[in-house]
């Protein structure tokens, strides 16, 4: 099931999904001056089964002036460089995304795509946070967030990460006390069913990732 909203925003941090759960959608969006080709797809969808998943449909953009161009070329390096994503461009790719059953890899760029990718995640998706360049992480717990289904509604767990400037003290003015659990309350307080599909495999993946993602200085 689709998560109703996006993962939480952490000041001075970005998040990335290392792989996208089957059912994830990616909007087909184009950068300024370009639009989707006529009869072009509105979104890409990660489809498949537990053994093999792939992105269905392709996003294609064309110049607003010439609506009938349909060429799809891999962007030049300078075009790729300008694209901003809500994911972390980590110096190393810590996990072989293909090794996760029921998940899709990061879709390759398409020509003239928008500067920001907008994904719509599904229940069970896990994303990982990293402080942006110039900030360092203060961990109070896992720097990750999971989309869960609780009481028939979706919500993202709260990542336990604070990003502080190198020159600053670790205590922010007005900083809240550390929370008891990633969700902001002990799990025992809630008695209803929590859907935790794929948590085991993603937690194992996170364990193998933690050293490479979060101890590598972001250059």
């Amino acid at each position: 099931e689709l998560c109703d909203d996006d993962p939480p925003e952490i000041p001075h941090a970005t998040f990335k999904a290392m792989a996208y759960k089957e059912g994830t959608m990616l909007n087909c969006e184009c950068k300024r001056g370009f639009r989707r080709i006529k009869s072009g797809s509105l979104y890409m969808l990660c489809t498949g089964n537990s053994s093999h998943s792939s992105w269905d449909n392709q996003c294609q953009c064309t110049s607003s002036a010439t609506r009938n161009t349909t060429k799809q070329v891999t962007p030049q390096p300078e075009e790729q460089k300008e694209r901003k994503t809500t994911e972390m461009q980590s110096p190393m790719q810590p996990v072989d995304q293909a090794s996760l059953p029921g998940h899709c890899r990061e879709p390759p760029p398409w020509e003239n795509e928008a500067t920001e990718r907008i994904y719509h995640f599904v229940v069970g998706q896990m994303v990982y946070y990293q402080c942006v360049q110039g900030y360092r992480a203060l961990h109070r717990g896992p720097a990750e967030s999971v989309c869960k289904m609780t009481h028939g509604k979706t919500r993202w767990t709260q990542p336990q990460l604070i990003c502080t400037g190198e020159m600053e003290t670790s205590q922010f003015p007005g900083e809240e006390k550390p929370q008891a659990s990633p969700e902001g309350r002990p799990e025992s307080e809630t008695s209803c069913l929590v859907t935790t599909t794929d948590f085991q495999i993603q937690t194992e993946m996170a364990a193998t990732m933690e050293t490479s993602i979060f101890t590598t200085e972001y250059q």
């Epitope: 109703d4 797809s41 509105l42």
Partner: antibody, heavy 115, light 107 residues
């Protein structure tokens, strides 16, 4: 909870314009497209267009290109649709609806065009 | 534009019945087919997207199937609250287009 609250019913004269609003709450407004859909009494649904509130990028159904103008105000998480040069054909219920697969809809706003 | 056709404009059924509503596209829409429910008060809800994916909060008695140009919505065990009009919609390409609707009534 995701909610889309549309402005109230409008009564307008032929040739006039109306601007209706759709106030979004319960989600990050800029991360979801906002669509507008028309439904004439006793008839089906017609897609008018959508706006990406993050970039103000719009796409319109060719049929409504000269009729509707979509805008969004990020600061108030509100989407707007202006209908111009109204005729009796524009009398309908108009819905705002969010998302890539259009997953949540407003309650609908009735526009009546009459002299 | 892609035309969406719901050949049955109204359908009568009894509580507990299994009801199937069909929808046909004028060209292949690659499973990008959504189903909506509209109640008599005008409220519209997404039931199913991408042919068979249940939207959150939708009862499991609703299911969808199909491929290519032919799609269907099935209500396995009709309940009173299911009395409504059902629309299919293709979300593959712009402009998204809707079927004419199938009004479900109680016998």
């Amino acid at each position: 909870d995701v909610q889309l609250q549309e402005s109230g019913a409008e009564l307008a004269k032929p040739g006039a314009s109306v601007k209706m609003s759709c106030k979004a709450s319960g989600y990050t407004f800029t991360r979801f497209w906002m669509h507008w859909v028309k439904q004439r009494p006793g008839q089906g649904l017609e897609w008018i267009g959508y706006i990406n509130p993050s970039t103000d990028y719009t796409e319109y159904n060719q049929k409504f290109k000269d009729k509707a103008t979509l805008t969004a105000d990020k600061s108030s998480s509100t989407a707007y649709m202006q209908l111009s040069s109204l005729t009796s054909e524009d009398s309908a219920v108009y819905y705002c609806a969010r998302g890539t697969v259009v997953d949540y809809w407003g309650q609908g706003a009735t526009v009546t065009v009459s002299s | 534009d892609i035309q969406m056709t719901q050949t049955t404009s109204s359908l009568s059924a009894s509580l507990g019945d299994r009801v199937t509503i069909s929808c046909r596209a004028s060209q292949d829409i690659s499973n990008y087919l959504n189903w909506y429910q509209q109640k008599s008060d005008g409220t519209v809800k997404l039931l199913i997207y991408y042919t068979s994916r249940l939207h959150s909060g939708v009862p499991s008695r609703f299911s969808g199937s199909g491929s290519g140009t032919d799609y269907s919505l099935t209500i396995s065990n009709l309940e009173q609250e299911d009395i409504a009009t059902y629309f299919c919609q293709q979300g593959n390409t712009l402009p998204p287009t809707f079927g004419g609707g199938t009004k479900l009534e109680m016998k």
